[in-house]
């Protein structure tokens, strides 16, 4: 039975040209995390394999940085980065857990940042 839950940064906003940390946290399970995929609807941004380390898709290599932890830092944001992002936790023996983050990239210099992510 899958007992885990994923906590995410939820809906966040950031300024064009700035950077943002996408962060998820899996809790309430003893399952082993084997891999975390960071994805948009139709493409892979990055993979963090617990054993093999990071893979970053070439189209994002110049503006995505791995971490902190299993999170992902998006840099040099453009309005085209607005949209849904998914953290997909591959675990054993539970299976797959998915978290969703909505990022809005604002033209304005007064972008209101969502509450900072905290792991309780």
């Amino acid at each position: 039975m899958m007992t885990g839950t994923i906590e995410t940064t939820g809906n966040i906003s950031a300024e064009k040209g700035g950077s943002i940390i996408l962060q998820c946290h899996l809790s309430s399970t003893t399952a082993q995390v084997t891999q975390v995929n960071w994805e948009q609807q139709d493409q892979l941004l990055a993979i963090c394999n617990a054993d093999l380390g990071w893979h970053i898709s070439p189209s994002f290599k110049d503006r995505v940085a791995p971490g902190p932890g299993l999170g992902l830092t998006l840099q040099s944001l453009t309005v085209n980065d607005t949209g849904e992002y998914f953290c997909i936790y591959h675990t054993y023996p539970d299976g797959t857990y998915t978290g969703r983050i909505f990022l809005e990239v604002l033209e304005s210099s007064v972008a209101e940042h969502g509450a900072r992510f905290q792991i309780p």
Epitope: L44, I47, D51, L52, G53, P58, S59
Partner: antibody, heavy 119, light 107 residues
Framework: QVQLVQSGAEVKKPGASVKISCKTS????????LHWVRQAPGQGLEWIGG????????SYAQKFQGRATLTVDTSTSTAYMELSSLRSEDTAVYYC????????????WGQGTLVTVSS | DIQMTQSPSSLSASVGDRVTITCRAS??????VVWYQQKPGKAPKLLIY???YRYTGVPSRFSGSGSGTDFTLTISSLQPEDFATYYC?????????FGQGTKLEIK
């Protein structure tokens, strides 16, 4: 330039073990993940597993879990693959392959090591 | 495990022909697919990755496309040195798996 040079051909009896080396040069050893792939005569490519020289983390295909052991020696920039309890079906060319920085594509390949298992 | 199925298994073509090889994943692998070329007695060589980027030194006649479960490798105008076996591979999740290969032969 990046080079992966493997040890020479081996002939082994069923039940024995074989250990193949892959000496790397031309890059910082701990930056690239190293994988092992095999190819039986006339057959396709099969991923055995990979190792991250930075932390020694290993990932194996289920089929080889417990029978293959991947290790590295960072002092000599060399990776090793040991396969135990050999059987005739393990007769194959074994390749080491390196994937680049933050990348899982196998950009660099050794020349291959033929392992023949025969009684 | 994710299965990668290539078609066709073998293909006869002539120099100058346009050739397309397809690869289908058993589940969504986004854009985490690469293509290799292998000649007899030699190690494979990386051709295309992610899945439309040509690796360094690969001629522009090679191109890749696709996302999700369906991927293609296209050679726009076959050259004599292109006759080889081609493999797709997914690296979306371990174990990394290869297609069974497509052998491209001279007609």
């Amino acid at each position: 330039q990046v080079q992966l040079v493997q040890s020479g051909a081996e002939v082994k009896k069923p039940g024995a073990s074989v250990k193949i080396s892959c000496k790397t040069s031309g890059y910082t050893f701990t930056e690239y993940t190293l994988h092992w792939v095999r190819q039986a005569p006339g057959q396709g490519l099969e991923w055995i597993g990979g190792i991250n020289p930075n932390n020694g983390g290993t990932s194996y295909a289920q089929k080889f879990q417990g029978r293959a052991t991947l290790t590295v020696d960072t002092s000599t920039s060399t990776a090793y693959m040991e396969l135990s309890s050999l059987r005739s079906e393990d007769t194959a060319v074994y390749y080491c392959a390196g994937s680049g920085y933050y990348d899982y594509s196998f950009a660099y390949w050794g020349q291959g090591t033929l392992v023949t298992v025969s009684s | 495990d994710i299965q990668m199925t290539q078609s066709p298994s073998s293909l006869s073509a002539s120099v100058g022909d346009r050739v397309t090889i397809t690869c289908r994943a058993s589940q969504d692998v986004k854009n985490a697919v690469v293509w290799y070329q292998q000649k007899p007695g030699k190690a494979p060589k990386l051709l295309i990755y992610s899945p439309s980027y040509r690796y360094t030194g690969v001629p522009s006649r090679f191109s890749g496309s696709g996302s999700g479960t369906d991927f293609t490798l296209t050679i726009s105008s076959l050259q004599p040195e292109d006759f080889a076996t081609y493999y797709c591979q997914q690296h979306y999740s371990t174990p990394f798996t290869f297609g069974q290969g497509t052998k491209l032969e001279i007609k």
